[in-house]
């Protein structure tokens, strides 16, 4: 079955947006006026995963780019990436659990959970232009609250 | 509380248009699909189609693709459905319907339906 | 398209009764489904969605289940009230598709 899409943005609760670091990351940073047409764009798709009541599985590639945020160990520390993947396979329902990230969704903030690495969040540093990063703790310095703005299609 | 308000009964000859409308309020309208189903007559439920306000997504049923056009006005909060080269077989209970953006609610409120008649 | 296949058409049963309806997908729809009662000449009431999740407002004696593409909504003590038809619906895939109904009336 095709998968169900659609296309966003994402900024932390600091109002940072993302955009791209190179080939393979992803930095948070304040964007004002025209500068937010350098924001990255997702297509977020709605993907099988756990049945839980309050976190919905999504996957986050970036809009005409085959590249997905996964979750990988890297030296034993669970770490994101940015992944290349075949366009003629993906976005797909059945997506690696690496690729799946449970969206959790309280009064319009957004979490971004790895269901690969139950309690580690998509995360940004409070400090501007730094990498986003996959953190294993909420509520601390760093940041994992997101919102969400729709985009055309 | 939310809500969806169909426009009213409309009567119709077979090859005309007609349109109908369902305002929401209580929620973001942005961030719900809007869904249309339709009721024949002493008949069962059909999916039309579907909008996101918020990005303008629209998914119909290949059986409806010609036969209805789905709109949505984000400054009135209002969705549209447009019927064209109407037959006395459209005659039916038209819904709106609202699911969150990510589907995982179901068609939880529903509008109290249209009901449009095909006669000559 | 998904066809819903839902059992039985119609079914007549007594106040305090427990009653079920069922309907077989037929493929596997991720546990997007939903059931709705009807009412003569009103709109679809949502019942329940995901499978098992209650719909606010919904008396706990409406309950879902599946098990594997075969879909379960029971009413443990019927009421008055429940007299009515329920459809199922799958929303996991373009296009949507509903059950054919279950006509609820008393015996």
């Known amino acids: 079955a095709p998968v169900r899409s659609l296309n966003c943005t994402l900024r932390d609760s600091q109002q940072k947006s993302l955009v791209m670091s190179g080939p393979y990351e992803l930095k948070a940073l304040h964007l004002q006026g025209q500068d937010m047409e350098q924001q990255v764009v997702f297509s977020m798709s709605f993907v099988q995963g756990e049945e839980s009541n309050d976190k919905i599985p999504v996957a986050l590639g970036l809009k005409e780019k085959n590249l997905y945020l996964s979750c990988v160990l890297k030296d034993d520390k669970p770490t994101l990436q940015l992944e290349s993947v075949d366009p003629k396979n993906y976005p797909k329902k059945k997506m690696e659990k690496r690729f799946v990230f449970n969206k959790i969704e309280i009064n319009n903030k957004l979490e971004f959970e790895s269901a690969q690495f139950p309690n580690w969040y998509i995360s940004t540093s409070q400090a501007e232009n730094m990498p986003v990063f996959l953190g294993g703790t909420k509520g601390g310095q760093d940041i994992t609250d997101f919102t969400m703005q729709f985009v055309s299609s | 509380q939310v809500q969806l308000v169909q426009s009213g009964a409309e009567v119709k000859k077979p090859g005309a248009s007609v349109k109908v409308s369902c305002k929401v309020s209580?929620?973001?309208?942005?961030?719900?699909?809007i869904e249309w189903v339709r009721q024949a007559p002493g008949k069962g439920l059909e999916w039309i189609g579907e909008i996101l306000p918020g990005q303008g997504n629209i998914n119909y049923n290949e059986k409806f693709k010609g036969k209805a056009t789905i709109t949505a006005d984000t400054s009135t909060d209002t969705a549209y459905m447009e019927l064209s080269s109407l037959r006395s077989e459209d005659t039916a209970v038209y819904y709106c319907?609202?699911?969150?953006?990510?589907?995982?609610?179901?068609?939880?409120?529903w509008g109290q339906g249209t009901l449009v008649t095909v006669s000559s | 398209d998904i066809q819903m296949t839902q059992s039985p058409s119609s079914l007549s049963a007594s106040v305090g009764d427990r009653v079920t309806i069922t309907c077989k997908a037929s493929?596997?729809?991720?546990?997007?489904l939903s059931w709705f009662q009807q009412k003569p000449g009103k709109a679809p009431k949502s019942l329940i969605y995901?499978?098992?999740r209650l719909v606010d407002g919904v008396p706990s004696r409406f309950s879902g289940s599946a098990s594997g593409t075969d879909y379960t909504l029971t009413i443990s003590s019927l009421q008055p009230e429940d007299f009515a038809t329920y459809y199922c619906l799958q929303y996991d895939e373009f296009p949507y598709t509903f059950g054919q109904g279950t006509k609820l009336e008393i015996k």
């Open positions: 319907s609202t699911i969150y953006y990510d589907y995982d609610q179901g068609f939880t409120y």
């Open positions: 209580g929620y973001t309208f942005s961030r719900y699909w």
């Open positions: 493929q596997d729809i991720d546990r997007y």
């Open positions: 995901r499978v098992k």
